[in-house]
Each structure stands twice: as C-alpha cells, then as structure tokens.
Interface confidence: low
C-alpha cells in the first residue's frame, strides 16, 4: 500500500485547511489509526490529533475546536483532517502517520501554505501641473504573503517602478506610477492591478487624473472692422483660454476705468452703441490656482462723419 | 483581459514527439497555475497535470507521467506541454487552463492528429 | 482517483424549461466542484465553482448546489444560447476529474 497526499497544501487565511492523508491498499487492509503532527524545525515534532478507527478523533487541546474529520460519508482509508480558520502560524510542516494492518506503519510529509491576501492601497502622487518633469502620479501598496505582483494599467504614458519589503510573514510590495503631466491627461484612468493567488481574481484600485493648466489667452472680436463704428450694436470683446481648474475672467481698460455700459459676463465683454468713447486698449486677465494670463487689444471706433479716419485694429498679447 | 494563446493544429507520425505552446497575457503568469486537459473527439474531459511557472513545480495524473512533460518560460508567459512516444490514442484536442483549484480562463485548444 | 458521474447523458429541452444535471462523486469532494459550459467547437467555460459560487458575468439562471458527494446543477430557463455540453469536475484531490458530460440541446 501506499500514501496518497500533497506534497504542498494551499489556504487561503481564514479559510479551512484539509490535510489529506489517504491510504490506498489491498481490499483486505484496514487503518487502525492515523496520528498527526506539526514539523516544527525549533520544537521538533508536536502532536496535532489521533484519529482512531474504533475511537474516534482525539485533538491536542492547543488545536481544540480546530481540527476536525471531513464532513460525512467517510472512507475509512481517509485519514485526513481539517485545520478550520488557518492562520499564518500554521504555514509549515505536516506529518500523518498511519498505522494499518496487516501491512504495517507508513509516513508522508507535506507543506501547509497560507495565502494572505492583500488589501491594497492606492496614493495619489503631489497635484499635478502641465510644465512640470517627471513626477509620481499614484505610488500602490500591498502587502499579503506571498508577496503580491503590483501593477499599472492605463493608456497613460509613464514609468513604473516597484520595491518590496519584507517581513517576517509576509511582504509588502510598492508601485511608484511617474509621469510628465500633460493637459490631455485630464480625466484619465490610472488604475493599479494587485495580483496574488490567493485572490479569486485580481484586485484593481483606479485612480482619475487631474493635471492643472492654463492656456494662453487671446482676444477675437476685431476681425469685422465694420462693427466697430459710432451708433454700432452689438459690439463683442471675447476672451479665449482653458485651464483646469477652469479660469476666472477679469476685463481692465489700460488707460482708465470700463466706459459706463460696458457689459462683464464672464469671458465677454459687451457694448452699448458704439462712440468714440470706446476707442482704448482692453485688458482679459485669465487666472486659476495655477497661473495667469493676460491679452490686450486695442479698439479704435471710426467716427463715419470723418471720412479721413481709419478704423485701426491692434492686438498685441 | 485574461487569455490564454495556443499554438495551432499540429499532423505528427506516430512515435514522434510535440510541444505544445501556451502563452498567457492580462495576468501575472506566476501567481497562477497552468493546468493541461486532453479532450479526444465526441468525450469527455481528462486532467493531465498542472505546472506551476511562479517555482516551475508541476504534478501529473498516472496516466501520463510518462507520456507529458510541462515546462514554463517566465519571460515569455509561455507554458509547454511536450507529448513522446505518440499514438493514434493521442489525437485529441489539448486545452492550457489557467487556476488555482478551478479553472477559470481556457486556452482555445490545441487539434493534435497522430496518423502515418 | 475520484470517479465523477454524470446524469443524464443527453437532455432534449425547450425554450424556458427547467433544467437539471447531477454529479454523483465516488468519495466526499467537500464542496470542491465546478462546472463547466462548452459550446460546439469553442474551450469550456467556468460557470460555476466551489459548488456554489457563479463566476464573474455569468447570468443568474445558473445555479449549483451541493456538498459531499451528491450535486446538482440548474438551469432555471433555458435559452437557445445555453445550447452546449455541460460538465462538473472535482478539484478536491489530485487527479481532477471530470464527470461525462451532458449534452444540451433545444427542441
């Protein structure tokens, strides 16, 4: 005859453990008891259990209420045990012993290991701006034994690097995702996979990048020279820029306060009936938490009564 | 996404030998094992074995311990599967398996046909 | 090894019936099964594993039950795309076996 069993058992924590010991023999052969034991390289061989043919299963009070007989219906040739809720502490060696008639004593090893799965952990990176270099957008951290694979998913351009600590049961795994920030990273995923087999699947943590920016600003509404007469409506300054966080709009005149119903909505500046009064230079002041822009144009309002006058458009930034 | 990429259709003699290829991608090919599984025409399922890339440890059903050798390239995610000594019992259709215990992820199968 | 049988062989259903496959093992697998869909000319499908448990995106008219030795399997109403051969395995202990297969087909 001869022992069937796992050279290597795997759980994962807070999973139940089945130490299999199985004896396959002749027909006539019988298993009279089958005695359990941890390895343990320091204190040497420490009983777990005796499972008895005629009287039953006998535990070690320091495993009392943790091991156990598979559930029902048994094969008498099985001598395998559960190890119920296994924790890091079991890893390690496992001996059966089984005693049959009338074949004699055998004996086999096998390794309990334990999985810890890992909670992993993501961290953004310090906030991201366009012009910075090569800076961390997200480091990921997971720790589980053995030691888990990090790693980054995204259609994001970058670098990854990863370090590992270990500790005495188990290994904590780093991932550092850097980048050069660019505008059109805005809103991208940056997810981190955290592998490890004992996890049913792996674990993804996702991460959305903001990367602050400011465009340069420029005025339009001086391409029609025709709007910019005296007794004109409907006359229109706009201010052009983006940036994340989305800017704030500001109107200035360079040489002396808005004339009286010049309009501010936002980005625009709107006019009443054009007169001469209008003619100066306009400043758009564009700014968020990251920078600021300005434009300047300058309006000269062609009086029609004055022949001689041109309409003369500037625009300088 | 996780998949497993067989190679293709392999028409051998008998008495040769063949490596089957599988390579994994979408997952970290050494934290799972890679089971193999012969599937002749019109039957069932049979385990041949299991290799496991992340310490290249590998188990065999009796049946094949003689006929099966699995190996693995962790730099390329690739598992093999060579076959000796081939019979017309050996035509079949051979799939990779990713899993734990279960297998949750297939290769697309491999069609061996052992004829003279 | 552990010898898995499967029951029926052949099973010839209609659009919305009920279904069920049973899986008897030769020695207590615990609650280590799972079960498989392979459909004409494609690798199987995980459906169903740890007796139990459905795997990711598979739709709820599949269920499995079972502990020990005796398991069932269910399709709560079939549809035309469940067409297909379905078999349990046992991952209790090496060697992992497979039951016979039931091939599923649509009236």
């Known amino acids: 005859g001869e022992l069937e069993t796992s050279d290597v058992v795997t759980v994962v924590l807070g999973q139940d453990a089945k130490l299999p010991c199985f004896y396959r023999g002749d027909p006539d052969e019988q298993v009279g008891q089958v005695a359990w034991a941890r390895v343990d390289p320091n204190e040497g061989i420490r009983e777990l259990a005796l499972l008895h043919s005629k009287y039953g299963l006998h535990v070690n009070p320091a495993y009392e209420d943790r091991v156990e007989q598979p559930p029902p219906p048994r094969d008498p040739l099985d001598g395998s045990v559960l190890l119920r809720n296994a924790v890091q502490a079991d890893e390690g060696e496992y001996e059966c012993r089984v005693s049959t008639f009338p074949a004699g004593s055998f004996q086999a090893r096998m390794r309990l290991r334990v999985l810890v799965p890992p909670l992993p952990s993501l961290n953004p990176g310090p906030p991201l701006e366009e012009g910075q270099g090569l800076t961390l957008a997200a480091s990921c951290t997971a720790e589980g034994s053995p030691a888990p694979s990090v790693t980054w998913d995204t259609e994001v351009k970058g670098t990854q690097s990863s370090r590992s600590f270990t500790h005495p049961r188990s290994a904590a795994v780093t991932s550092e995702f850097h980048l050069v920030p660019s505008r059109s990273m805005n809103g991208q995923p940056l997810t981190c996979v955290v592998s490890h087999p004992g996890l049913l699947q792996d674990r993804r943590i996702t991460h959305t990048l903001q990367v602050a920016f400011l465009a340069e600003a420029s005025v339009r509404g001086l391409e029609d020279q025709n709007l910019w007469q005296v007794g004109r409506e409907g006359a229109t300054l706009k201010c052009l820029s983006e940036g994340q966080p989305p800017p704030k709009y500001n109107w200035t005149r360079l040489d002396g306060p808005l004339p009286s119903g010049v309009r501010v909505k936002g980005d625009t500046l709107g006019f009443p009936p054009l007169t001469t009064e209008h003619s100066g230079v306009y400043v758009c002041h564009v700014s968020n938490e990251l920078s600021s822009r300005d434009s300047q144009v300058t309006v000269e309002v062609l009086d029609p009564e004055d022949p001689g006058k041109q309409v003369d458009l500037v625009s300088a930034s | 996404q996780v998949q497993l990429q067989q190679s293709g259709p392999e028409l051998v003699k008998p008495g040769a030998s063949v490596r089957i290829s599988c390579k994994a991608s979408?997952?970290?090919?050494?934290?799972?094992?890679i089971h193999w599984v012969k599937q002749r025409p019109g039957q069932g399922l049979e385990w041949i074995g299991w290799?496991?890339?992340?310490?290249?440890?590998?188990k065999y059903t009796e049946n094949f311990k003689d006929k099966a050798t699995l190996t693995a390239d962790k730099s390329s995610s690739t598992a093999y599967m060579q076959l000796s000594s081939l019979t017309s019992e050996d035509s079949a259709v051979y799939f990779c398996?990713?899993?734990?215990?279960?297998?949750?992820?297939w290769g697309q199968g491999t069609t061996l046909t052992v004829s003279s | 090894s552990i010898v898995m049988t499967q029951t029926p062989k052949f099973l010839l259903v209609s659009a919305g019936d009920r279904v069920t496959i049973t899986c008897k093992a030769s020695?207590?697998?615990?609650?280590?099964v799972a079960w498989y869909q392979q459909k004409p000319g494609q690798s199987p499908k995980l459906l169903i594993y740890?007796?139990?448990n459905r795997d990711t995106g598979v739709p709820d008219r599949f269920t499995g039950s079972g502990f020990g030795t005796d398991f069932t399997f269910t399709i709560s109403s079939v549809q035309a795309e469940d067409l297909a051969v379905y078999f349990c395995?046992?991952?209790?202990?090496?060697?992992?076996?497979f039951g016979g297969g039931t091939k599923l087909e649509i009236k």
């Open positions: 020695q207590s697998v615990n609650n280590d």
């Open positions: 979408g997952y970290t090919f050494t934290t799972y094992y």
């Open positions: 398996a990713r899993g734990l215990y279960y297998f949750d992820f």
């Open positions: 290799i496991y890339p992340g310490n290249v440890n590998t």
């Open positions: 395995q046992q991952d209790y202990s090496s060697p992992y076996t």
């Open positions: 740890y007796a139990s």
